[in-house]
């Protein structure tokens, strides 16, 4: 955790690092370790990759224990093979508007992700890709007998775009906040980030929070009921304490986690909230970190690593933070 103790390195000479990850001396000058990458947790002993201009951002001067690897101010972003300057906005596809900020990319969907339930007016709603349109749009297949409510007016026209929500326009500032990114880990403690200008100075800033989609040790597939293919939100029987680089949460939490599927789908957070969690470290120091708490999960085929980088990127993001 810190450098006060003597140097103790693993028996094997040097770890093998994945491609593109630097082998560096740890922060104590003791052992060679694989450098932590952008968005990963870092400590004094686990340094960030200096060759990529990363530093360990501890968030506040009071907390010098655990930070997040962050790009230095003004660091560019590499996205889809293109380099973008910090502060630059770009449309990654017709469906997403993205912003680069100090090495981190935050994207906002330009298409509505709304859901439509059947009703007498729209008994068989379908989302379809219309020629010449980027976003899928709702189409209501009329029932066979044509006993549709309301007069049979000309085919309805879908609004193509919505202006900014007026409540989100402050004096000389169009408030924009990207979705929280998907958790950096599919199990165990990870990091989720977003970009926002929702602050007094209307300046773009990065925000990060801890996240845990599911514990790594849980064998969730065992709990899938016979005949079912997924367990969306498995029951966690007992309250748990979160662990973060040797520090333990002060309170216990009856947290919700996302389950698994046996048919190739993945289950990811759908609705989440962000709450502060206090961690107590062995030396008695207490630090406060924002953490994602899951309200509901969704199981879908838009899994990490799917063909369309933008689709899988967005669908793995949180559907929206609820207060």
């Amino acid at each position: 955790q810190n450098c006060s103790g003597p140097c103790r390195c693993p028996a094997e000479q040097a770890p093998r690092c994945p491609a593109g990850v630097s082998l560096v001396l740890d922060g104590c000058g003791c052992c060679r370790v694989c450098a932590k990458q952008l968005g990963e947790l870092c400590t004094e002993r686990d340094p960030c990759d200096p060759h990529k201009g990363l530093f360990c951002d501890f968030g506040s001067p009071a907390n010098r224990k655990i930070g997040v690897c962050t790009a230095k101010d003004g660091a560019p972003c590499i996205f889809g093979g293109t380099v973008y300057r910090s502060g630059e906005s770009f449309q990654s596809s017709c469906k997403y508007q993205c912003t680069c900020l100090d090495g981190a990319v935050g994207c906002m969907p330009l298409c509505s992700m709304d859901v439509r339930l059947p009703s007498p007016d729209c008994p068989f709603p379908r989302r379809v890709k219309l020629p010449g349109k980027c976003c899928e749009e709702w189409v209501c297949d009329e029932p066979k007998d044509q006993t549709v409510v309301g007069p049979a007016l000309a085919a309805y026209r879908l609004e193509d775009t919505f202006g900014p929500d007026p409540t989100m326009i402050r004096a000389n500032c169009l408030v924009q906040t990207t979705e929280w990114s998907a958790c950096s880990k599919t199990c165990g403690m990870g990091i989720s980030t977003r970009v926002t200008n929702d602050n007094a100075s209307c300046r773009l800033e990065k925000q990060s929070r801890l996240c845990m989609v599911r514990p790594c040790e849980a064998d969730l597939e065992e709990n899938i009921k016979k005949g079912k293919k997924c367990i969306r939100t498995p029951k966690i029987s007992k309250p748990i304490k979160f662990e973060l680089s040797g520090c333990t949460s002060v309170k216990t939490y009856r947290a919700k986690f996302c389950g698994v599927c046996t048919d190739g789908r993945c289950c990811t957070p759908h609705r989440t909230t962000t709450l502060p969690v206090e961690f107590k470290c062995p030396d008695g120091e207490v630090m406060k970190k924002n953490m994602m708490f899951i309200k509901t999960c969704a199981c879908h085929y838009n899994c990490p690593g799917d063909n369309d980088i933008f689709e899988s990127l967005y669908y793995r993001k949180m559907y929206g933070d609820m207060a």
Partner: antibody, heavy 114, light 110 residues
Framework: EVTLKESGPVLVKPTETLTLTCTVS????????VHWIRQPPGKGLEWLGV???????DYNAAFMSRLTISKDTSKSQVVFTMTNMDPVDTATYYC????????WGQGTTVTVSS | ETVVTQEPSFSVSPGGTVTLTCRSS?????????ANWVQQTPGQAFRGLIG???NRAPGVPDRFSGSILGNKAALTITGAQADDESDYYC?????????FGGGTKLTVLG
């Protein structure tokens, strides 16, 4: 984010006309209909009427002669008008999106009193 | 006049399963009635749970499910939680209008 918000007077005199506006965001009125529902104090829900995505309307038969619902799609607004108000019409009035009544406004409480 | 009837009140233990029903005075409930279920929380806020008999609204946990049981529409809550304590209303469509039931007050014991 889908939101609906009702606005209008909180106090109406008997025999007067009540006009409420439901302003929506996050969806288009040409894609979804909007219902009006009310809840008298301490009682259950009463469906009043709907304007569908294509402009047609349906009303609760008990209010047919007093009710009009219209919309301005470009302004994302639905207007609800109820004539000849009576003290028994005192209630919280809600607009809700068609399709499972999945999203509701926060409601506006209307008191009918002289 | 068509009347839609719900149980006035129901109680369930935490973790238990409860089924609320919705009966029509003019015959069996079918999918053509597009049964909707709406929750009113103690804070008076409404949210749709189920539309078109059995379709969950976005963000509604899969503990909530809608179906037709015999001649009635039904809302089943499995693994009941303390924050499920609310009023639940069903609404049925009758060709030209909806009718709401009187609502069920659900109490989660303990």
């Amino acid at each position: 984010e889908v939101t609906l918000k009702e606005s209008g007077p909180v106090l109406v005199k008997p025999t007067e006309t009540l006009t409420l506006t439901c302003t929506v965001s996050g969806f288009s009125l040409s894609t979804f209909g909007v219902h009006w529902i009310r809840q008298p104090p301490g009682k259950g829900l009463e469906w009043l009427g709907v304007i569908w995505r294509r402009g047609g309307t349906d009303y609760n038969a008990a209010f047919m002669s007093r009710l009009t619902i219209s919309k301005d799609t470009s302004k994302s607004q639905v207007v609800f008008t109820m004539t000849n108000m009576d003290p028994v019409d005192t209630a919280t009035y809600y607009c809700a999106r068609d399709g499972g009544f999945d999203y509701w406004g926060q409601g506006t409480t209307v008191t009918v009193s002289s | 006049e068509t009347v839609v009837t719900q149980e006035p009140s129901f109680s369930v233990s935490p973790g238990g399963t409860v089924t609320l029903t919705c009966r029509s005075s003019i015959g069996a409930v079918t999918t053509s009635n597009y049964a909707n279920w709406v929750q009113q929380t103690p804070g008076q806020a409404f949210r749709g749970l189920i539309g078109g008999t059995s379709n969950r609204a976005p963000g509604v946990p899969d503990r909530f499910s809608g179906s037709i049981l015999g001649n009635k529409a039904a809302l089943t809550i499995t693994g009941a939680q303390a924050d499920d304590e609310s009023d639940y209303y069903c609404a049925l469509w009758y060709s030209t209008h909806y009718v709401f039931g009187g609502g069920t007050k659900l109490t989660v014991l303990g």
